[in-house]
């Protein structure tokens, strides 16, 4: 039975040209996290494997940085980065947990940022 829950940064906004941290946290389960995948709609951005470490998609290497923790940092944001992002936790024995974040990249010089996410 899957008892875990994923907390995310939720809906966030950032300024064009800036950077943003996408963060998820899996709680309420003792399942072992074997891998976390970060996806943007139909594209895999990065993988953090518990045994093998971080691996960034070659097509995003110049704009995506691993961390902090199991989070992901997006840099040099463009309006095309607006959209849904997913953190997918592969766990044993529970299976897969998915968290969703919506990022809006704003043209204006003032972007309202969502509440800063902290891992308890």
């Amino acid at each position: 039975m899957m008892t875990g829950t994923i907390e995310t940064t939720g809906n966030i906004s950032a300024e064009k040209g800036g950077s943003i941290i996408l963060q998820c946290h899996l709680s309420s389960t003792t399942a072992q996290v074997t891998q976390v995948n970060w996806e943007q709609q139909d594209q895999l951005l990065a993988i953090c494997n518990a045994d093998l470490g971080w691996h960034i998609s070659p097509s995003f290497k110049d704009r995506v940085a691993p961390g902090p923790g199991l989070g992901l940092t997006l840099q040099s944001l463009t309006v095309n980065d607006t959209g849904e992002y997913f953190c997918i936790y592969h766990t044993y024995p529970d299976g897969t947990y998915t968290g969703r974040i919506f990022l809006e990249v704003l043209e204006s010089s003032v972007a309202e940022h969502g509440a800063r996410f902290q891992i308890p």
Partner: antibody, heavy 117, light 107 residues
């Protein structure tokens, strides 16, 4: 030029072990994964396991756990795959490959392992 | 484990014609699929990674598409040197499973 050069063909008896080497050159050995894949006669390619030479971290396919050991020697830029308790079904060509983001961009020439009594 | 099912098992195409190979994943793999060409007596060669990105030096007659669970490798104009077995592989999660292969021949 990136190259992965594997050790030569081996003939082993059932129950024995085999250790295949894979010497890397032409790139920073610790910046990429080394993956091991085999192909038995008439079968599909089968992924066996992987090592991160930088950290030493490994990940193995469940069916090989306890029978396979993958190691890496940073000083010689060489990875090793040891398979124990050999049986006839382990007769195959064994490949090492450089792992970039978990796909395999350079492959060794392959090492034929024959298990026969 | 994620099962990769390729179709067809074999394909005979006339020189200059299009060859299409399909690969279906048993569960979501995003765009985490690579395609390899394997000729007898040689090591496999990477053609496509992340479903649609052509690897360095691969001729542009090779293209890949798909996301989620359904993927396609297309050879737009088959050449004699393209005779080989083609494999899909998911690089989404360990173990990194391969499809059963598709043998491409000249008709």
């Amino acid at each position: 030029e990136v190259q992965l050069v594997q050790s030569g063909a081996e003939v082993k008896k059932p129950g024995a072990s085999v250790k295949v080497s894979c010497k890397a050159s032409g790139y920073a050995f610790t910046n990429y994964l080394i993956e091991w894949v085999r192909q038995a006669p008439g079968q599909r390619l089968e992924w066996m396991g992987v090592i991160n030479p930088g950290s030493g971290g490994t990940n193995y396919k469940e069916k090989f756990k306890g029978r396979v050991t993958i190691t890496a020697d940073k000083s010689s830029s060489t990875a090793y795959m040891e398979l124990s308790s050999l049986r006839s079904e382990d007769t195959a060509v064994y490949y090492c490959a450089r792992g970039e983001y978990f796909f395999f961009d350079y492959w060794g020439q392959g090492t034929t392992v024959t298990v026969s009594s | 484990d994620i099962v990769m099912t390729q179709s067809p098992d074999s394909l005979a195409v006339s020189l200059g014609e299009r060859a299409t190979i399909n690969c279906k994943a048993s569960q979501h793999v995003s765009n985490g699929v690579a395609w390899y060409q394997h000729k007898p007596g040689q090591s496999p060669k990477l053609l496509i990674y992340s479903a649609s990105y052509r690897y360095t030096g691969v001729p542009d007659r090779f293209s890949g598409s798909g996301s989620g669970t359904d993927f396609t490798l297309t050879i737009s104009s088959l050449q004699a040197e393209d005779v080989a077995v083609y494999y899909c592989q998911q690089h989404y999660n360990t173990p990194h499973t391969f499809g059963g292969g598709t043998k491409v021949e000249i008709k």
